[in-house]
Interface confidence: medium
């Protein structure tokens, strides 16, 4: 019995659902009563899911697996794995027995995008040319381990005096901290890039250091210049810092976070204590770090509706404020491709190819091309509909006149994550079975 699985690993984002494809070719007269289907972990032989005696025997794997019962009779033995975790990574074997027996293994590669790096300087004031500065680049909650690169303002790689550490949390996701020690020139830009080798996702940030004394007077409040990019459902840190003077105590501090446009209160710290969240109970400060000048805000379980500008107001004796932008994002699913009509196709027929990708944010850019890599822009209609969470489902329709045969590819690009998801269909102008 020939059992077919994809050659390439299935790549799944942490927290999403993954389909481990497996198929067989049922003979005429096949009934599910004849089918024994077992999914197990290839290495440990641990049972994951099974179908026997004409019935789905259910999940033996943390109740997170399911078959496609309506498709089994057509030979689709695929397994749905829900809420993927890092610990799920590995090889799964699909065993199919009817009269004959066959098996094949499919690999699951788990991935999670890294957050946009935050950059910190130590020391961060009274800097002069010749001073040695430690620049820390931190990026969070990615998988697998990242590749980290540094470079200067001229694009020159910096490899000396770099120390990078990667620590896995209890979910197996990595936090990356890379430290660069540099001797300051008159001024300089230093950039760090954190690359996810599986997703080919790059996250980078820069810091420009101008060694000079900051003017006395107003409190200098520092926030990142670039928007903070946060994935829907994850936590985001809106960084804000000030430089406390010697003898500073929290009793002197008034800190207010508010929505820049509407002035709606988000969180505050006054009279020496945290006054708590005024924003759906999803915000928190870093109380242990306030005395060092860290006024950052943690926003939990980010939603599309959170996107926008947040202002950090700091008042001690003097007063200062700065606004930080939150850019919300969600990766698009791998597109599914459908054909209409999908059989008895001949050269000269007009075919409608639909490319659908789901639950992304913000709106996607959609591109089509043929098998020669030539962009297809005519006869394309793309619609994007937001669901109740504000996430977009994309449907792009291409109308083509068939040649002898042809490949048509659609790419759905998330412009914020620079995440590309693509699907292809190859049409042979002859009766299709």
């Amino acid at each position: 019995l020939e059992v077919q699985v994809p050659e390439d690993p299935v790549v799944a984002l942490v927290g999403t659902d993954a389909t481990l494809c497996c198929s067989f070719s049922p003979e005429p007269g096949f009934s599910l009563a004849q089918l024994n289907l077992i999914w197990q972990l290839t290495d440990t032989k641990q049972l994951v899911h099974s179908f026997a005696e004409g019935q789905d025997q259910g999940s033996a794997y943390a109740n997170r697996t399911a078959l496609f019962p309506d498709l089994l009779a057509q030979g689709n033995a695929s397994l749905r794995l829900q809420r993927v975790r890092v610990a799920d990574e590995g090889s799964f074997t699909c065993f199919v027995s009817i009269r004959d027996f066959g098996s094949a293994a499919v690999s699951l590669q788990v991935a999670a995008p890294y957050s946009k790096p935050s950059m910190t300087l130590e020391p961060n004031k009274d800097l002069r040319p010749g001073d040695t500065v430690t620049i820390t680049c931190s990026s969070y909650q990615g998988y697998p381990e990242a590749e980290v690169f540094w470079q200067d303002g001229q694009g020159v790689p910096l490899t000396g005096n770099v120390t990078t550490s990667q620590m896995a949390n209890e979910q197996g996701l990595f936090d990356v901290h890379s430290i660069l020690r540099v001797v300051l020139g008159a001024n300089g830009t230093y950039s760090c890039l954190v690359r996810n080798p599986v997703l080919q996702q790059d996250a980078h940030s820069s810091v420009t250091i101008t060694p000079q004394r900051s003017p006395t007077g107003a409190v200098e409040v520092q926030v990142p210049e670039d928007p903070v990019v946060a994935l829907v459902g994850t936590d985001a840190t809106l960084r804000c810092s000030f430089s406390p003077e010697p003898g500073f105590s929290l009793a002197q501090l008034n800190l207010i976070w508010q929505l820049t446009d509407t002035k709606q209160l988000v969180h505050s710290f006054t009279e020496g204590r945290d006054q708590g969240s005024a924003y759906a109970n999803r915000t928190a400060l870093f109380p242990d770090l306030l005395a060092q000048g860290n006024a950052s805000l943690r926003l939990q379980r980010v939603r599309v509706a959170d996107e926008g500008s947040f202002t950090c107001f700091v008042s001690i004796r003097d007063f200062g404020s700065a606004a930080v932008s939150l850019q919300v994002a969600a990766p698009y699913s791998k597109p599914s491709m459908t054909l209409e009509p999908n059989k008895d196709l001949r050269p000269g027929d007009t075919v409608t190819i639909t490319c659908s990708s789901y639950r992304g944010y913000p709106e996607a850019e959609v591109f089509w091309q043929d098998g020669q890599g030539v962009p297809l822009t005519g006869n394309v209609t793309t619609s994007q509909m937001a669901n109740e969470q504000g996430l977009f489902d994309v449907h792009s329709v291409l109308r083509v006149v068939l040649g002898a045969n042809g490949t048509y590819s659609c790419l759905v690009r998330n412009p914020v994550l620079q995440q590309d998801a693509h699907g292809s269909v190859t049409i042979t102008g002859q009766p299709m079975t």
Epitope: V156, P157, L193, D202, H204
Partner: antibody
Amino acid sequence: EVQLVQSGAEVKKPGASVKVSCKASGYTFTEYIMHWVRQAPGQGLEWMGGINPNQGGTTYNQKFKGRVTMTRDTSISTAYMELSRLRSEDTAVYYCARKGKDYFDWYFDVWGQGTTVTVSS
Amino acid sequence: DIQLTQSPSSLSASVGDRVTMTCSASSSVSYMHWYQQKPGKAPKLLIYDTSKLASGVPSRFSGSGSGTDFTLTISSLQPEDFATYYCQQWSASPLTFGGGTKVEIK
């Protein structure tokens, strides 16, 4: 179409200086770092250095430090490479080459056609 | 400086042959890039970041490797592929090129 068009061939005497230009078109000049690479007759490629047209910052191969100067004129989207105190072993084809756009692209995606510099007494 | 050693320095092959050339770095690099140069012409980017095909480059070209050992493969040599191929790194300054592999007609 993205193009880098270089100035014409030069013949110089030992000890003189040469200044080669590279005019960019088809893209935003200040968004890409420009580098210079040379190739002696029958030899391989040798990196000389680069300039960030946005703020004029430069990086040079130590081998050429003190002899090479890279400048740019953003108003005419042109980069320049000047090599001084020429000697016969500087006879080569000099190429300008554009570094990939993403900040961490450490390769050259577009090249000029080359300028032949001959140093001979 | 990181030295890049290309081997072989030259090779003879026929149209349709599978051709492989290597680039060995004196110390570990993050990525290798490959260029093709024809006589009297400027180099042309073929492969970047070790394995990514540059725009407009035919899929018969592929790159692989990591650490200190990298490979460029032409799966089925075409008449227009007879040229010199250079590897390049910039994981550490200065940027360096390999000495080249010349692919000639057998």
